[in-house]
Interface confidence: low
């Protein structure tokens, strides 16, 4: 049988960075300022994202790609494509509705984002605590008590916790 040939859509010839302008007899027109088209054959250009306020521009908008934002100092990205900026906290803290709060005893957070997580329970793996946990650091599990030589201590004092931002001296 003979295949019917469909007429080619004239808009399919319009490359990224242009749009198929119905007002101009489907001529490919460049995207106006502050807009883009990332694929060919588009009948409109999309408005560029603007990185305002707590957002700052990581990549400028071009005729073929949207702007990309990241967050100003003190905030970090959340969501696909950095759709939100969330306040940073210090290590040893988590963000609550009332702001940054220290981790409760028995929990830690070694990052400037996220929630405080419980210290590892070494005994569940038959091990003992080798280094105590802090607000900023998880415990370090060591060998099981049976593996320790007589007289050996199962706990060593924790290393001094560093404020985030400090470099090792």
């Amino acid at each position: 049988f003979e295949r019917t040939r469909s007429l080619q859509d004239p808009c399919s010839n319009c490359p990224a960075g242009t749009f198929c302008d119905n007002n101009r007899n489907q001529i490919c027109s460049p995207c106006p300022p502050n807009s883009f088209s990332s694929a060919g054959g588009q009948r409109t250009c999309d408005i560029c994202r603007q990185c305002k306020g707590v957002f700052r521009t990581r990549k400028e908008c071009s005729s073929t790609s949207n702007a990309e934002c990241d967050c100003t100092p003190g905030f970090h990205c959340l969501g696909a494509g950095c759709s939100m900026c969330e306040q940073d906290c210090k290590q040893g803290q988590e963000l609550t509705k009332k702001g940054c709060k220290d981790c409760c005893f028995g929990t830690f957070n070694d990052q400037k984002r996220g929630i405080c997580r419980p210290w590892t329970n070494c005994s569940l793996d038959g091990k003992s605590v080798l280094v105590n946990g802090t607000k900023e650091r998880d415990v370090v599990c060591g060998p099981s008590p049976a593996d320790l030589s007589p007289g050996a201590s199962s706990v060593t004092p924790p290393a001094p916790a560093r404020e985030p931002g400090h470099s090792p001296q």
């Epitope: 400028e60 967050c71 100003t72 100092p73 970090h76 940073d88 702001g99 990052q111």
Partner: antibody, heavy 121, light 111 residues
Framework: EVQLVQSGAEVKKPGASVKVSCKAS????????MDWVRQAPGQGLEWMGN????????NYAEKFKSRVTLTVDTSISTAYMELSRLRSDDTAVYYC??????????????WGQGTLVTVSS | DIVMTQSPDSLAVSLGERATINCRAS??????????MHWYQQKPGQPPKLLIK???NLESGVPDRFSGSGSGTDFTLTISSLQAEDVAVYYC?????????FGGGTKVEIK
Amino acid sequence: EVQLVQSGAEVKKPGASVKVSCKASGYTFTSYWMDWVRQAPGQGLEWMGNIYPDSGGTNYAEKFKSRVTLTVDTSISTAYMELSRLRSDDTAVYYCAREEALGGYYELTYWGQGTLVTVSS
Amino acid sequence: DIVMTQSPDSLAVSLGERATINCRASQSVSTSSYSYMHWYQQKPGQPPKLLIKYASNLESGVPDRFSGSGSGTDFTLTISSLQAEDVAVYYCQHSWEIPYTFGGGTKVEIK
């Protein structure tokens, strides 16, 4: 060891352009913002702008927006600062400096040695 | 833009004595967690060197006679016991927003 090595001194005539390079080594070039700061003779430090090598995204101080272009060549871990329509008051030492961007904090931890650009007729 | 105002412009201090440099921002550069204020030292013919970050955190390798304090709009760099090698120009800088700006600098000399 992080190192930023800049191109040599330049003498230019008013109205000309200059392109200063900054070759980075000792770290992942694409992962850190690179800033440009200038210092006129006997004067203070003036922030010009920065570029994120991974995406080519830039920020410029308003004063320099129309005359400065920041670019990178990631294949050779090099950042460039081009200043056009030079005037005599553009005579300065131009520094590249890498931001310490871990966790979203931005201090200028590593600096190039500086490139003296002299604009004179 | 945030304007950074440093004082004094210059400072002459005897060896072993305390030197204090102030920096005021035209708006707050602090959150509840951090102050986005940094201090740099620049000696003649050299690039600036980071001394203090986030108002009070000493950069690695910097002698502990240097210290920083303050939050909001007012910040201080202190050299507790001035040494000959501390003769330099000191700059404050904020990283609160684009554009970053520097203070005008304070020249520290030996009396």
